[in-house]
């Protein structure tokens, strides 16, 4: 047994982080493997994660963390048994993949105005809470070619725009992801979508009637 | 071993300025938050606020904000809190502890006394 | 902000014999990441206080086995088996699941 895709990790920054890897045949992960993290510190016990199959010779792990300081390192070590695999080592904040934001919502009851609002997906003590910025994706069910994204680079969790700027009278579905500058992230996964119906008044025109002034001489 | 070894006692004048150190031996700041707790005499304890000291993001109990300033200095290993427009109720001992990811060490405390 | 509610505020117990202090918290102490960081603290007299026991149950390193931790959702326990001399001080739950993070009012524990 050998791994051939050595594992790969990715943090929420916050409690989670996720390995996979891949091994040079299938393999049951959960009976045959284990995987010990411990973090890099002063009375820091190991932890075991159970993996989980991701596909026929894939396996994922979710190693649970208390909390996240900039400067943590976790050793990583994989075994089959009594035999080691794989020894390596992950830095959680080289390697942040955010949270989804969450509790989207569209109101639609503001006259011609959407207002998008979504959660933040970190409590306050956490450092990315004040450092995310958010891409807002908008799309029409009716028409695949009405899709559009809005980039969010101010904090607060929201987004308005004119509903004249969208079609009237149909359906479309909203959803956002975040990222953090300041640790180079990737993108998070996107918020479950959320579907509105899009009807506004069309403004009234006027037609200007150009009124010609007889001037009596 | 570890240790946290904070500055001397202080007596100032109301309206004046503190300063309070913590010098950590034993390991590196870096690797855990910083947080200051406060004990007026004969009461009990009262969570201030924290530091994560590599990229210095604060957050601070609503009472003290404004009140206290923590910093941190991963050079020299020391943990830092500033208490502003010093009061006689700001008359207490002010502990450092890290936290990683409970409070497993702290500092003996340093009182702040505050009298005309 | 969370309020920590300790009974009793003072215990005086006979050496040899169990002690409970409750610590109840005005709302739930579960943090966004499912774990329940209530903890519990033991000042003695003239000290800084010390860890005894980390997310409800866990007792830290060193601390003698009669002490033991419970509870879940509002309402937490300290049990001491068997209550010796060099347990007096003033006992401290504390929750960090939520900023700002608060402690209880203290529990003072003497021996007769």
């Known amino acids: 047994m050998k791994v051939l895709q050595e594992p790969t990790c990715v943090s929420d920054y916050m409690s989670i982080s996720t390995c996979e890897w891949k091994m040079n045949g299938p393999t049951n992960c959960s009976t045959e493997l284990r995987l010990l993290y411990q973090l890099v510190f002063l009375l820091s016990e190991a932890h075991t994660c159970i993996p989980e199959n991701n596909g026929g010779a894939g396996c994922v792990c979710h190693l649970l963390m208390d909390d996240v300081v900039s400067a943590d390192n976790y050793t990583l070590d994989l075994w089959a048994g009594q035999q080691l695999l794989w020894k390596g080592s992950f830095k959680p904040s080289e390697h942040v993949k955010p949270r989804a934001p969450g509790n989207l919502t569209v109101h639609t009851n503001v006259s011609d105005t959407l207002l998008l609002t979504w959660s933040n997906p970190y409590p306050p003590d956490n450092y990315l809470y004040n450092h995310l910025t958010y891409a807002v994706n908008i799309w029409s069910e009716n028409d695949p070619a009405d899709f559009r994204i809005y980039n969010v680079t101010y904090l607060e969790p929201s987004l308005r725009i004119a509903a004249s700027t969208l079609k009237s009278g149909i359906s479309y579905r909203a959803r956002v992801r975040a990222w953090a500058q300041c640790y180079n992230t990737t993108w998070s996964e996107w918020s479950p979508s959320t579907k509105w119906h899009n009807s506004y008044r069309e403004p009234f025109e006027q037609h200007h009637h150009h009124h010609h002034h007889h001037h009596h001489h | 071993e570890v240790q946290l070894v904070q500055s001397g006692a202080e007596v100032k004048k109301p309206g004046a300025t503190v300063k309070i150190s913590c010098k950590v031996s034993?390991?590196?700041?870096?690797?855990?938050?910083m947080h200051w707790v406060k004990q007026a005499p004969g009461k009990g304890l009262e969570w201030m606020g924290r530091?994560?000291?590599?990229?210095?993001?604060?957050i601070y109990a609503s009472k003290f904000q404004g009140k206290a300033t923590i910093t941190a200095d991963t050079s020299s290993n020391t943990a830092y809190m500033e208490l502003s427009s010093l009061r006689s109720e700001d008359t207490a001992v002010y502990h450092c502890?890290?936290?990683?990811?409970?409070?497993?060490?702290w500092g003996q405390g340093t009182l702040v006394t505050v009298s005309s | 902000d969370i309020v920590m509610t300790q009974t009793p505020l003072s215990l005086s117990v006979t050496p040899g014999q169990p002690a409970s202090i409750s610590c109840r918290s005005s709302?739930?102490?579960?943090?966004?990441?499912?774990?329940?960081?209530l903890e519990w603290y033991l000042q003695k007299p003239g000290q800084s206080p010390q860890l005894l026991i980390y997310k409800v149950t866990n007792r830290f390193s060193g601390v003698p086995d009669r002490f033991s931790g419970s509870g879940s959702g509002t309402d937490f326990t300290l049990k001491i088996s068997r209550v010796e001399a060099e347990d007096v001080g003033v006992y401290y739950c504390f929750q960090g699941s939520h900023v700002p993070y608060t402690f209880g009012q203290g529990t003072k524990l003497e021996i007769k």
């Open positions: 502890v890290s936290r990683r990811p409970w409070f497993a060490y």
């Open positions: 034993g390991f590196n700041i870096k690797d855990t938050y």
């Open positions: 709302q739930s102490i579960v943090h966004s990441n499912g774990n329940t960081y």
């Open positions: 530091i994560d000291p590599t990229n210095g993001y604060t």
